[in-house]
Interface confidence: medium
Amino acid sequence: EVEKTACPSGKKAPEIDESLIFYKKWELEACVDAALLATQMDRVNAIPFTYEQLDVLKHKLDELYPQGYPESVIQHLGYLFLKMSPEDIRKWNVTSLETLKALLEVNKGHEMSPQVATLIDRFVKGRGQLDKDTLDTLTAFYPGYLCSLSPEELSSVPPSSIWAVRPQDLDTCDPRQLDVLYPKARLAFQNMNGSEYFVKIQSFLGGAPTEDLKALSQQNVSMDLATFMKLRTDAVLPLTVAEVQKLLGPHVEGLKAEERHRPVRDWILRQRQDDLDTLGLGLQG
């Protein structure tokens, strides 16, 4: 806490400008009007304040807005956002995607901090659902964002938002999350033709049930081994050797290299040796 002191004569700041970097902390506290700061927040990023000076500016805004900052100020926080605590952010009502983008830009290149996680949570809750534009924005800044959500949170994602999801956005998703996302993807892409549909649905297939895999095996999709290895074991086990052969197409030879790993290992153990021999890969059931 900076103690209250009178502003020295001639040092009252008429505007937020670069001369303020040479103000001591107590001078900033005494000589910068909080309301002026709030209206000229966009200038702060153009001034290389030290961390300690930023603390003073934050303190001034906190005094001016004890119930939480208005969005007009939040949008222009810039680097001052890095000084906010999750508790500060919980007081905010952020509704504009532009505000969200501006603050995510400040944190760009860093891990998702507790502040950013709180900001996103406040924003999504305010919108009521994770719409396509929001998802587009969030996955652009944090490719792993979708997989950081719980299955319950993912259930609020409308199928239309799935179009914003890129394969890399699902890299760290576990089966429980894919179980939620797959039916939404299936619905989102249902009007596409066979090959285009497979390209889009491929990264979601870790949540696909057996009957959908059987259906895909009839469409000459040539699934690669990396995708096959991510399928649910319980969905793969009922597939016949013929169905797996059709599903993988030319990639079927890759089963040999994966024979000791799930789900291939478990699937092999469920098959008749005669059927496995038809593949000519030397797989032992």
Epitope: E18, K24, K25, I47, P48, Y51, G109, H110
Partner: antibody, heavy 121, light 107 residues
Framework: QVQLQQPGAELIKPGASVKLSCKAS????????MHWVKQRPGQGLEWIGI????????NYNERFKSKATLTVDKSSSTAYMQLSSLTSEDSAVYYC??????????????WGTGTTVTVSS | DIVMTQSHRFMSTSVGDRVSITCKAS??????VAWYQQKPGQSPKLLIY???TQHTGVPDRFTGSGSGTDFTLTINNVQSEDLLDYFC?????????FGAGTKLELK
């Protein structure tokens, strides 16, 4: 990797001016503040000033306000410092330096190679 | 301006020893202090920031401590390649200022 390349040396006559360059590579030049630091032989370091390549905002140490002018050329990712009315006191190594991450952390983990300026007739 | 005083311009040590280089700020700078190492004819290299946080790739034998006005860079098990110049810097307020440096020498 991140690099700040500076010419090795400049020999300048007293009273003249010199424009030192600092070519950045390996990062987005316009996203980070660039600082300039002076080091006289066998002495400590002095902070000269700072410039933001994107917004052109500059701030100077009071001691260098009438001596140094900082500019940038975004198209070539190069920062410049012009030193005017040179005297023997300006003979020194001049470094450009960059903080690689957070705003507010004004210490430097990326330094230029340094330019030795010698003022002599 | 905040003056950073490194009281020893030179310090003698032996390989394998532990040495502490001190830096005193003329006013409270919190933990906004960095330490640099400099080889002759080269640019400084960051060792420590925020008074005690080790920069990436810096050997564990280099540690920083202190807050307020008194700061220390400690080198445990000094190696021959550590016999160089060391500078402190404050970034609590402008203008940013450096210590005059301490040169580590062999006893």
């Amino acid at each position: 990797q991140v690099q700040l390349q500076q010419p090795g040396a400049e020999l300048i006559k007293p009273g003249a001016s010199v424009k030192l360059s600092c070519k950045a590579s390996g990062y987005t030049f316009t996203s980070y503040w660039m600082h300039w630091v002076k080091q006289r032989p066998g002495q400590g370091l002095e902070w000269i000033g700072i410039i933001h390549p994107n917004i052109g905002s500059t701030n100077y140490n009071e001691r260098f306000k009438s001596k140094a002018t900082l500019t940038v050329d975004k198209s070539s990712s190069t920062a410049y410092m012009q030193l005017s009315s040179l005297t023997s006191e300006d003979s020194a190594v001049y470094y450009c330096a960059r903080r690689s991450s957070n705003y507010g952390d004004w210490y430097f983990d990326v330094w230029g190679t340094g330019t030795t300026v010698t003022v002599s007739s | 301006d905040i003056v950073m005083t490194q009281s020893h311009r030179f310090m003698s040590t032996s390989v394998g020893d532990r040495v502490s280089i001190t830096c005193k700020a003329s006013q409270d700078v919190g933990t906004s202090v960095a330490w640099y190492q400099q080889k002759p004819g080269q640019s400084p290299k960051l060792l420590i920031y925020w008074a005690s946080t080790q920069h990436t790739g810096v050997p564990d034998r280099f540690t920083g401590s202190g807050s307020g006005t008194d700061f220390t860079l400690t080198i445990n098990n000094v190696q021959s390649e550590d016999l160089l110049d060391y500078f402190c810097q404050q970034y609590s307020s402008y203008p940013l200022t450096f210590g005059a440096g301490t040169k580590l020498e062999l006893k």
